[in-house]
């Protein structure tokens, strides 16, 4: 005999999240980013895979490419030429690193309703793009750049020295892709397609990381990647520009490097075209506290690029590294010489500045104890940007418009009051001349994408509101989330706490700290997520906390640069401090506290477990860094300097996980890593394991064969199932 269900009680029809829900992606959300093709038109791939053109002003739409055509070549992506005559169709996607992939490309002629035959593109292609005007094609094949004047024409080969793992043209090498650009491409068309700029990376002298890829063969194969670790030889970069109308006339012309940069090891950080005959390059010293922005002009008489010293703008940090995570990029105004850029103001907050002649004379556009985060668009009369100013929550993002046509400039928050409870974290996508824009809200409520008039900011329509997700969540007991702050010794520690649905302050709960904590990162954000930690709170009754300590972003340079040259100290201290504060709140079972993290978070969780505080019963490190000598030069040296005696070798040695092996004796430690991790090499975990074995310290470990830093596919399910068992065992929760 079973009791009949009480239908009028909401509690009885509600269920907790299951691990299966998370692994199946049952509660994933959709966003809508229009593929803008003009001021008022955009393309979108419909649910049934047709490519549809939407005209905002008429409210009408029509299909320009049928799903039948897409399916005929198994296309997973497309790109319309600016003259609207052709579409490239991308298939056979094969992932390489974080952004890079190779693919097969077919060109479809819209006017004739057929694929372009003759002079087909080679395969697989590493990168392909249309010119900004017309239908010229630039592509990279086998590390060389090719140009087609029209899709059916034979290609013109621009570079000839490309060689696998040695010379990269038009695409970055591993370290530039991951840590500097960060993109899959390194070529840039001028605004009207007259010129094509590209980078050449010479990796001939870079040491190679080699690891086994087991596959199914009798013998594993070896993956070799030129990968500069801290202090190692770096790629040598050169920038060239070629006239695409007459490419054979003078050939590629090298752009000179500023003298103050070229005097020692340096990086190229970005290229921005201003006009067809003016280009802006950004360079960075290897010791990344000096950046130079160089504006170069085409000399018609010599067919060369001239970069006068008077057009060099220096950005320097005296308290840390230049920029935030990356040095910011300029957004040029219509006069084609002045620009807007985000950098630290005198109070140590990142703000928008207007540079007309020199950086010293920059006019500060935004100011306050908050940070400007991104400049989306500058038009004749408006500048659109995002910041975390509103209500002083650093983990929010709102979109603002500053009128630059009038004086004094007036500021308006476009998003602050739109859907205040649901939406506090926005990004935006603008059409040509900012005639219209899409807002994508990521939370804290269910994400929603909307279309707006660029003049009035009026909402025109909802593009995606995730109705299905909303309905699916109606009978789910989601955890409660709080974002609050702790004030400790003049440091503000923002935290997010995820609480079980029936949370009762008078009870005691196990606590799991989820940490990332890397320089210029932010974990405490007002975004929507139904993920593994949501399940742990909803079903397993855990309290989960995320804490942004020293080194994290968007709260000023004092917090950000606190970790400069000293990684692995304050990030860990601040997690520990927060845990002590959480215990004081009275609802944490101090005998059941765990910490886990991935990547940089794995490093911090390992150091926290080995801190000797006795606070943590157990913890997990997924793909952790274990010594900064093992990680990439560009990233590591930005924050740590060089691992040399006369620089910062001592702290490189002090900050390893291996040095703390003894301290793992009194905690339960689960160490996890993919054997084919191109980013944080398996070497890191291998060395932790070796040190623990040598110290005769017991620990648990799991490796994922042939998996990279993301541990994707079936490994994901195995990983989260394994970590769940580990935590439930640690917290004495029944299975």
């Amino acid at each position: 005999l079973r009791p009949s269900r009480v239908h009028n009680s909401e509690e009885n029809t509600m269920r907790a999240l299951t691990l299966k829900d998370i692994l199946n992606g049952t509660f994933s959300y959709k966003t809508f980013f229009p593929n803008w093709i003009s001021g008022q038109e955009y393309l979108h791939q419909s649910a049934d895979n047709n490519i549809v053109l939407y005209n905002i002003e008429t409210g009408q739409s029509y299909t320009i490419l049928s799903n039948r055509t897409m399916k005929s070549v198994n296309a997973s992506n497309y790109g319309l030429s600016p003259d609207r005559q052709f579409v490239y169709l991308e298939s056979d996607y094969s992932k390489l690193w974080r952004y890079s992939y190779t693919a097969t490309y077919y060109i479809y002629d819209l006017s004739n309703g057929e694929f372009v035959r003759g002079n087909e593109l080679p395969r697989p292609i590493q990168y392909l793009c249309w010119s900004p005007v017309g239908s010229k094609l630039a592509y990279v094949y086998q590390n060389n750049i090719y140009l087609k004047q029209r899709p059916g024409d034979p290609p013109f080969q621009i570079t000839f020295n490309g060689r696998e793992n040695k010379i990269f043209n038009g695409i970055p090498d591993w370290v530039y892709e991951e840590e500097m650009l960060p993109t899959k491409y390194a070529l840039w068309w001028s605004p009207n397609g007259k010129f094509l700029a590209y980078a050449e990376f010479n990796d001939k002298d870079i040491p190679v990381i080699a690891y086994s890829y087991y596959g199914d063969e009798q013998y594993p194969r070896t993956i070799n990647i030129p990968y500069p670790k801290a202090g190692a030889k770096n790629p040598v970069v050169r920038i060239f520009i070629i006239d695409t109308t007459y490419p054979a006339y003078v050939g590629p012309q090298e752009v000179p490097v500023p003298a103050m940069i070229a005097s020692s090891d340096y990086y190229f950080s970005w290229l921005t075209w201003v006009t067809d005959e003016r280009v802006c390059l950004q360079w960075l010293k290897r010791v990344q506290n000096v950046s130079v922005l160089s504006i170069c002009d085409f000399r018609e008489d010599w067919q060369t690029w001239d970069c006068p010293k008077t057009q060099e703008h220096i950005e320097e940090s005296r308290t840390g590294w230049a920029g935030g995570f990356f040095v910011s990029r300029p957004v040029f105004s219509y006069d084609a010489i002045s620009y807007y850029k985000i950098f630290s103001d005198k109070d140590g907050y990142k703000h928008i500045h207007y540079i007309k002649d020199t950086v010293e004379n920059a006019i500060q556009i935004t100011s306050g104890k908050w940070e400007a985060i991104n400049i989306f668009r500058v038009t004749q009369d408006s500048l659109f940007y995002s910041s975390n100013e509103f209500e002083e929550y650093p983990g929010r993002r709102n979109i603002y418009r500053i009128s630059i046509g009038s004086y004094p400039p007036s500021k308006k928050c476009v998003t602050c009051h739109l859907r205040k409870e649901r939406c506090q974290y926005y990004t935006a996508s603008f059409s040509d001349y900012a005639k219209y824009y899409a807002l994508v809200c990521y939370g804290p409520g269910i994400p929603i994408s909307t279309l707006h008039d660029g003049r009035t900011d009026q909402e025109i329509k909802i593009l995606e509101e995730n109705k299905e997700l909303e309905n699916a969540l109606k009978n789910i007991q989601l955890p409660k989330e709080e974002i609050k702050k702790l004030e400790v010794d003049e440091i503000t520690l923002w935290y997010k706490m995820i609480l079980p649905p029936q949370f009762d302050r008078s009870k005691k709960y196990p606590l799991l700290i989820q940490v990332y904590g890397g320089p210029c990162s932010q974990s405490v954000r007002s975004v929507f997520a139904v993920n593994w930690i949501s399940y742990l709170a909803s079903k397993e009754g855990m309290v989960i906390a995320l804490v942004d300590g020293r080194g994290t972003a968007f709260q000023g340079d004092k917090l950000l640069y606190a970790v400069y040259r000293k990684l692995g100290v304050y990030e860990v201290e601040d997690q520990i401090t927060a845990v002590r504060k959480f215990i004081e709140m009275g609802f944490i079972d101090e005998k059941r506290i765990a910490i886990w993290g991935w990547s940089y978070g794995g490093y911090v969780s390992s150091l926290a477990l080995a801190s000797g505080t006795g606070l943590f019963k157990c913890g997990i490190a997924v793909a952790p860094v274990s010594s900064w000598e093992y990680y990439a030069s560009v990233y590591t040296e930005r924050f740590m300097g060089l691992p040399t005696k006369d620089d910062n070798l001592e702290h490189y040695k002090n900050s390893t996980v291996m040095a703390r092996a003894e301290y793992f004796r009194n905690v339960d430690y689960l160490l996890i890593h993919g054997t084919a991790d191109d980013n944080v090499h398996f070497q890191n975990s291998a060395q932790i394991a070796k040190a623990l074995v040598n110290a005769q310290v017991d620990f648990q470990a799991m490796w994922y064969s042939d998996q990279n830093h993301g541990l994707s596919g079936l490994s994901t399910n195995h990983l989260y199932t394994h970590m769940t068992h580990f935590l439930k065992q640690c917290f004495s929760l029944s299975d």
Partner: nanobody
Framework: QVQLQESGGGLVQAGGSLRLSCAVS????????MGWYRQAPGKRRELVAG???????TYADAVKGRFTISRDNAKNTLYLQMNSLKPEDTAVYYC?????????WGQGTQVTVSS
């Protein structure tokens, strides 16, 4: 239902001029990007000129400086003014949205340029 009716073609001597018209119904031409296309015997159809819903225009290299695309909003009509015509301009000329829909073309109007 969108309908496009091209007219104004004919036989003309090299160096001469023609003005093609396209009566548009079912959509407002001024609010849509529209284009003129042509197909020469034994050749593929190609874009001749495109006119954005603003004022932006695109011309094929072969006709730049000789052809002008325009429209009359009141009449919902698209035009192509063709000057300094050459024998290689001989083709059937079509108007359509720009880019064209995947499944619709009008009848077109024949332009023949004799030398």
């Amino acid at each position: 239902q969108v309908q496009l009716q091209e007219s104004g073609g004919g036989l003309v001597q090299a160096g001469g001029s023609l003005r093609l018209s396209c009566a548009v119904s079912g959509i407002i031409s001024s609010m849509n990007a529209m284009g003129w296309y042509r197909q020469a015997p034994g050749k593929r159809r190609e874009l001749v000129a495109g006119l954005g819903s603003g004022v932006s225009t695109t011309y094929a290299d072969a006709v730049k400086g000789r052809f002008t695309i325009s429209r009359d909003n009141a009449k919902n009509t698209l035009y192509l003014q063709m000057n300094s015509l050459k024998p290689e301009d001989t083709a059937v000329y079509y108007c359509n949205r720009w880019p064209p829909p995947y499944d619709y073309w009008g009848q077109g109007t024949q332009v023949t340029v004799s030398s």
